[in-house]
Amino acid sequence: YFPQVFGKSNDGFVPTESYGTTSVQNVSQIFGRNDESTMPTRSYGTVCPRNWDFHQGKCFFFSFSESPWKDSMDYCATQGSTLAIVNTPEKLKYLQDIAGIENYFIGLVRQPGEKKWRWINNSVFNGNVTNQDQNFDCVTIGLTKTYDAASCEVSYRWICEMNAK
């Protein structure tokens, strides 16, 4: 169970420089089962908390500090958000462009004892994860421009995501 991806109140939220609305993108087959094309077009808000980046109806927080995956997830939860679910090519490119040469934990993990990679909403990821033969169960994005398996216990930066208001 994860907290809702909405902030608890408007406290700390400020309008971003980006305005307007945007519709959901279709998901390529590898980013999860090709389901999102069934979703209706809908409008999103444009307001994010301070120090969060707005993009296509979502707010993203890029940490400067580093933590293990579990602590990163807990931090996002305290902000009323989750680790980022990077399930479209466009979203991946946007986040990688900001990540630059740093590696950031995202909300993609492999359950110990299960071969499948899943997003933290439990949906299956059908794409390629590099370094997964090393028994790493968490994933980072950034420097290599791919989904990289990483040790959940090693500290990395992380990306939180929530719906814009």
Epitope: Y1, F2, P3, Q4, V5, F6, G32, R33, D35, E36, T38, M39, W69, K70, M73, T82, G107, V109, R110, Q111, P112, G113, E114, K116, R118, I120, N121, N122, S123, V124, D137, C152
Partner: antibody, heavy 124, light 111 residues
């Protein structure tokens, strides 16, 4: 590997009852969530609550179950469900079920092991 | 709340025939769907997960399909032992408390 429920029976309205689920062939540890699901006579399945079997004991409840139902891990092989303020609508077979899951990784997926259930009848 | 609507409530077919059971979610559940078989007096048994993956020991006569909000369980070459009630369940975590929603069930009668 198996699960067995106990503690069911006849209880009066507004009464309380505690059900127990005992695991055999495995221990309640990391990688599992233990859950309770109920089934009214001739009806469908209704999820009640889950508890992470690892050390954190994280719990999650169906919204309708909060306050009247409490799930607990009482040993390395047992989970309980405390029920209060029971009404006739709570009459059902209560099933213990196991889910693959790790609180550190967020996954609580499908139920891959079930007990046979214990019948709870609420009647005056 | 996430609601799973299962149809039909009952279906009948002859031995060797085929039955199709549908499950519709009130929102996109991204293939986080399981199917269970329950016989009278017994607990449910996992048949399928992630919409189309067979659980261990389940014959390939059982086939799951679907995406988005629409999912189907197809049982072909029906056998008498397939007579049971079938339930769908989603484990999609949308961030709300109401996880693990079940469909209402479909009774399969084998003639």
């Amino acid at each position: 590997q198996s699960l067995e429920e106990s503690g069911g029976g006849l209880v009066k309205p507004e009464g309380s009852l505690t059900l127990t689920c005992k695991a055999s062939g495995f221990t309640l540890s990391s990688y599992y969530y233990m859950c309770w699901v109920r089934q009214a006579p001739g009806k469908g399945l209704e999820w009640i609550a889950c508890i992470y079997a690892g050390s954190s004991g994280t719990t999650v409840y169906a919204s309708w179950a909060k306050g009247r139902f409490t799930i607990s891990k009482t040993s390395s092989t047992t989970v309980t469900l405390q029920m209060t303020s029971l009404t006739a609508a709570d009459t059902a077979t209560y099933l213990c079920a196991r889910k693959l899951g790790d609180v550190g990784y967020g996954h609580t997926t499908y139920f891959n092991l079930w007990g046979p259930g214990t019948l709870v009848t609420v009647s005056s | 709340a996430l609601v799973m609507t299962q149809t039909p409530s009952s279906v009948s077919a002859a031995v060797g025939g085929t039955v199709t059971i549908k499950c519709q979610a009130s929102q996109n559940i991204y293939s986080t769907l399981a199917w269970y078989q329950q016989k009278p007096g017994q607990p449910p048994k996992l048949l399928m997960f992630d919409a189309s993956d067979l659980a261990s020991g389940v014959p390939s006569r059982f086939k799951g399909s679907g995406s988005g909000t629409e999912y189907t369980l197809t049982i072909s070459d029906l056998e008498p032992a397939d007579a049971a009630t079938y339930f769908c369940q989603t484990y999609y975590d949308s961030g709300s408390d109401d996880l693990n929603a079940f469909g209402g069930g479909t009774e399969v009668v084998v003639k």
